[in-house]
Interface confidence: low
């Protein structure tokens, strides 16, 4: 089928000890090959500091996945979610504390 770019959605949730968990979800994309990773200061975090979900079919002939990491509250600006799919790439910031989601559809 033709390429369908992912919808990327970044959320944050409070964690203990002054940390927050940030999750980057990519959905409704085809084909299933995708790079999704958290970056700090523009550099990908090591694998052992991130958690990935499986790339799963979402029932519409497209796919979804996610990646999460835990960061210090107040350091949000240093982190971005990097997505690469079918030759296109984009970066997505962590939303500020008073706004709990942020999503873009990339063409």
């Amino acid at each position: 089928g033709s390429t369908v770019p992912p919808m990327v959605n970044v959320t944050r949730s409070e964690a203990s000890e002054g940390n927050i968990t940030v999750t980057c979800r990519a959905s409704s994309f085809y084909p299933r090959n995708i790079i999704l990773t958290w970056r700090q200061d523009g550099v990908s975090l090591s694998h052992d500091t991130q958690q990935w979900g499986d790339v799963l079919p979402d029932g519409n002939g497209t796919y979804q996945t996610w990646v999460a990491t835990r960061i210090c509250r107040g350091e949000e600006q240093r982190f971005t979610c990097y997505m690469e799919h079918s030759g296109n790439h984009s970066t997505h910031p962590v939303p500020s504390g008073n706004s709990h989601h942020h999503h873009h559809h990339h063409h």
Epitope: D41, G42, V43, E75
Partner: antibody, heavy 121, light 107 residues
Framework: EVQLVESGGGLVKPGGSLKLSCAAS????????MYWVRQTPEKRLEWVAT????????YYSDSVRGRFTISRDNAENTLYLQMSSLKSEDTAMYYC??????????????WGQGTSVTVSS | DIQMNQSPSSLSASLGDTITITCHAS??????LSWYQQKPGNIPKLLIY???HLHTGVPSRFSGRGSGTGFTLTISSLQPEDIATYYC?????????FGSGTKVEIK
């Protein structure tokens, strides 16, 4: 070969201003975070300021926030540090340094030769 | 702010000795620690990044270990050209902070 060449240092009176420059070559300047670090006469290293690759984010140490401004010109491959309201405790050697990128995460992998700033009446 | 407690402040060792320098972070910095060598009259140079990764061109007698709050730099078979001051730097949280330095001399 990565090269970072600082300029603009000198002797300035308290309350005065200076603008430091750092000319970068040998790498894709716009792809990397850039930093200013200073070394005091006692040889202590102090981080001063950081600017992100896309000019989106800047960070400052508490000791210079509101007085110093870091900026970059990606077209000219140049990093700047505008310093104002200078104090005697700003006397130091100022180094421009390059963020490590994917080959050296969370590190400053190349440093310039430094430019000396002396604040004295 | 994260404090970096580096020790010892100076040490004297014989050629061929193995020496260890320690940095202790006041908070968990994962592996966001790098080590620098500054020879007399020269500029700082990166030795180790990510706590344990040797920077390009650095001799293999240098090694780094640690994660969380405790980190070490080891120089095995000390050479005359290793006379220098060594600094650690944490990159986990702003403000970035350096250790106070360890001056290494030959007996």
């Amino acid at each position: 070969e990565v090269q970072l060449v600082e300029s603009g240092g000198g002797l300035v009176k308290p309350g005065g201003s200076l603008k430091l420059s750092c000319a970068a070559s040998g790498f894709t300047f716009s792809d990397y975070y850039m930093y200013w670090v200073r070394q005091t006469p006692e040889k202590r290293l102090e981080w001063v300021a950081t600017i992100s690759d896309g000019i989106t984010y800047t960070y400052y140490s508490d000791s210079v926030r509101g007085r110093f401004t870091i900026s970059r010109d990606n077209a000219e491959n140049t990093l700047y540090l505008q310093m104002s309201s200078l104090k005697s405790e700003d006397t130091a050697m100022y180094y421009c340094s390059k963020g490590g990128g994917s080959t050296a995460r969370g590190a400053l992998d190349f440093w310039g030769q430094g430019t000396s700033v002396t604040v004295s009446s | 702010d994260i404090q970096m407690n580096q020790s010892p402040s100076s040490l004297s060792a014989s050629l061929g000795d193995t020496i260890t320098i320690t940095c202790h972070a006041s908070q968990n910095i994962h592996v966001w620690l790098s080590w620098y060598q500054q020879k007399p009259g020269n500029i700082p140079k990166l030795l180790i990044y990510g706590a344990s990764h040797l920077h390009t061109g650095v001799p293999s007698r240098f090694s780094g270990r640690g994660s969380g709050t405790g980190f070490t730099l080891t120089i095995s078979s000390l050479q005359p050209e290793d006379i220098a001051t060594y600094y650690c730097l944490q990159g986990q949280s702003y403000p970035l902070t350096f250790g106070s330095g360890t001056k290494v001399e030959i007996k």
